[in-house]
């Protein structure tokens, strides 16, 4: 019995179906086919879970969180024992193993390994201003998404004809911050943060209203 090489890993957007491949060759009839799919979740590597089981001509559910979402892609028994996972969740990320036994065929490689990574687009980021909006001050524009896998990068732009940040601005696209030093009237305007990763983008907006000191009325 020989389980074929799997592609190293599969990436899928959260909520989309994933197919985890596993095929094998065997010299024996498929009368005593026994297939166990296991997962070692990334979130809990010490706690392997059963995903689905085929034994004695019957299918059995694995861990409760997979109930109703997992099945074999084809009619069993077969030499293609790939599975699908519907409505993928972040917690489905992990290393999946198919363990195949088909007595009396023994020997050879009976395990296939595939990694599954569930990707999440950036959630709508939260934009904030740190510091005083008085003219001459330094301000920090903050942007962060609560969700996003892979981790989003953040690009700030000023929403006007140029889309350029003021010349006194420095940007950190990893942290999602922009520091604008010595703000002036020309710093005022709408600033948009675009949070991006491999599968999506999301935006938020700030209205920077730089305030000049008001002349005092002298009684």
């Amino acid at each position: 019995l020989e389980v074929s090489e799997s592609p190293g890993s599969i990436q899928v957007a959260r909520g989309q179906p994933a197919v985890l491949p596993c095929t094998f060759t065997t010299s024996a009839a498929l009368i005593n086919l026994n297939v166990i799919w296991m997962v070692t979740p990334l979130s809990n590597a010490n706690q392997p879970e059963q995903v689905i089981l085929y034994q004695g001509g019957q299918m059995f559910d694995g861990a409760p969180r997979f109930h109703g979402r997992v099945g074999f892609t084809g009619t069993m028994p077969a030499t293609n024992v790939s599975i699908f996972i519907n409505n993928t969740q972040l917690s489905d990320t992990g290393t999946y193993q198919c363990l195949v036994n088909n007595l009396p065929d023994i020997g050879g490689r009976n395990i296939g390994v595939t990694g599954l990574t569930v990707l999440v687009p950036p959630s709508a980021p939260h934009c904030q201003i740190q510091g005083s909006q008085d003219i001459g001050s330094d301000v920090i524009l903050l942007c962060s998404s609560e969700e996003g896998i892979p981790r989003p990068t953040y690009l700030w732009e000023k929403l006007d004809n140029t889309l350029k940040l003021p010349p006194t601005a420095t940007q950190d696209q990893v942290q999602g911050t922009v520091t604008i030093r010595n703000i002036s009237a020309l710093s005022s305007g709408l600033y948009q943060c675009v949070a991006s990763n491999a599968i999506g983008t999301s935006t938020c907006l700030l209205d920077l209203q730089v305030i000049s000191p008001q002349p005092r009325n002298i009684g």
Partner: antibody, heavy 120, light 106 residues
Amino acid sequence: EVKLVESGGGLVQPGGSLKLSCAASGFTFSSYSMSWVRQTPEKRLEWVAYISNGGGSTYYPDTVKGRFTISRDNAKNTLYLQMSSLKSEDTAMYYCARHGDGYYPWFAYWGQGTLVTVSA
Amino acid sequence: QIVLSQSPAILSASPGEKVTMTCRASSSVSYIHWYQQKPGSSPKPWIYATSNLASGVPARFSGSGSGTSYSLTISRVEAEDAATYYCQQWSSNPFTFASGTKLEIK
């Protein structure tokens, strides 16, 4: 008391131009971003232009970009909207709106509006 | 562009009832604003940044939500609440409004 009074609306032919004004009082005009928002006869609200408090930054939706120009005169406490190449779909009540304090853009005060009708 | 949908389009309630109207966005947005408009008047700011009541808005109003789903709730409706309520987003240009929920008092 914050007060915004729009003027300049009226009947104009398709392809024509019109300039709206908004006189502001009761607050420090130069400290606040301003916008124009319109409401169609079907009661749909549409944001049409934004200008920063200093006047150096403007922004528009694609539907009016290149046809409408927002400006302000902080010395006169007045906001303007120059509209050109007008289309029938520009027919609406036009409101001048002052943005709120803080950094969330939102329309904290609205004027009573001025009606623009584009028709042959 | 982000499309905002409000439901229901028309909401009928008796004084004292609790009512909730929803605003759904076609993509995730960071916050929503709500405006109230009565016939013949200009819109008034009602709730800003999802949950903050604008000045003068009664405490029976509240706002909540995140991502693509937001709501405005009135704990005990009064006759003066009859109006059309619009939600609006500033996350992405164009800064769109929904078509509104008209609240009628029986």
